[in-house]
């Protein structure tokens, strides 16, 4: 009776279990009743990092110097290239696909410390009573407007991203 499931590092095809190709190799042909799975090593600048049945290897990541990137760790047939940014620059994400001089603080956060040559921008959440409605690399959280000092009342509460909205007091006739 043909199998419905295969062991680890195997895959089911044509009602039989074939061996997966090991990391660093791609599939050339599936196994048959009489032959083993045929695999081939990935070419230069290619990789596969898992046991697989892929017919094409993945291209190594390119660390584009025009984006401020350089190679942190050269790729192998089993691993992708790891990029990092030029000295003094910061990756925009874990994948490090582009570089920025320093990060900015999103709305709801203020700048606690402006970036220097050796440290990135330090952001802090705006506490109650303060807000920031912009992305910035220098602006702190701003205090909510004080409606009382303008002889007005709060019509809409403030948040960490928005100022309070003041309005006229209801006058009793």
């Amino acid at each position: 009776e043909p199998p419905t499931a295969c062991r680890e590092k195997q895959y089911l095809i044509n009602s039989q279990c074939c061996s997966l190709c090991q990391p660093g190799q791609k599939l050339v042909s599936d196994c048959t009743e009489f032959t083993e799975t045929e695999c081939l090593p990935c070419g230069e600048s290619e990789f596969l990092d898992t046991w697989n049945r892929e017919t094409h290897c993945h291209q190594h990541k390119y660390c584009d110097p025009n984006l401020g990137l350089r190679v942190q760790q050269k790729g192998t047939s089993e691993t992708d290239t790891i990029c990092t940014c030029e000295e003094g620059w910061h990756c925009t994400s874990e994948a490090c696909e582009s570089c920025v001089l320093h990060r900015s603080c999103s709305p709801g956060f203020g700048v606690k410390q402006i970036a220097t040559g050796v440290s990135d921008t330090i952001c802090e959440p705006c506490p109650v009573g303060f807000f920031s409605n912009v992305s910035s690399a220098f602006e702190k959280c701003h205090p909510w407007t004080s409606c009382e000092t303008k002889d007005l009342v709060v019509q809409q509460a403030g948040t960490n991203k928005t100022d309070v909205v003041c309005g006229p007091q209801d006058r009793l006739r």
Epitope: N66, L67, G68, C85, E86, W89, T92, S98, C99, V100, L101, H102, R103, S104, V134, S135, S136, A137, F138, E139
Partner: nanobody, 116 residues
Framework: EVQLLESGGGLVQPGGSLRLSCAAS???????EMWWVRQAPGKGLERVS?????????YYADSVKGRFTISRDNSKNTLYLQMNSLRAEDTAVYYC?????????WGQGTLVTVSS
Amino acid sequence: EVQLLESGGGLVQPGGSLRLSCAASGFTFRDYEMWWVRQAPGKGLERVSAINPQGTRTYYADSVKGRFTISRDNSKNTLYLQMNSLRAEDTAVYYCAKLPFFFHEWGQGTLVTVSS
């Protein structure tokens, strides 16, 4: 494509003044915080000054406070840096930059040399 073109640099004597300009294109200038950053020979990048999109709030590094003034004209898509009482230590290439400071969105800079 974002383009930032700095101009106005040159050779000036200590105590002199210069006004740098940065012509911006390829993005909505009025929506972005803008910065002036400089790089002295053999040194790292130094954040000099910044201005918010509306031009109502500014930042200055301690080294230039009271001597430099940042401003912007959103109708002309241009950023300015008025530099007074220049010192030898202000010698550097000056760059303008927009948030979020992508490496590939920088201009070529303009060289300011302060020397007698």
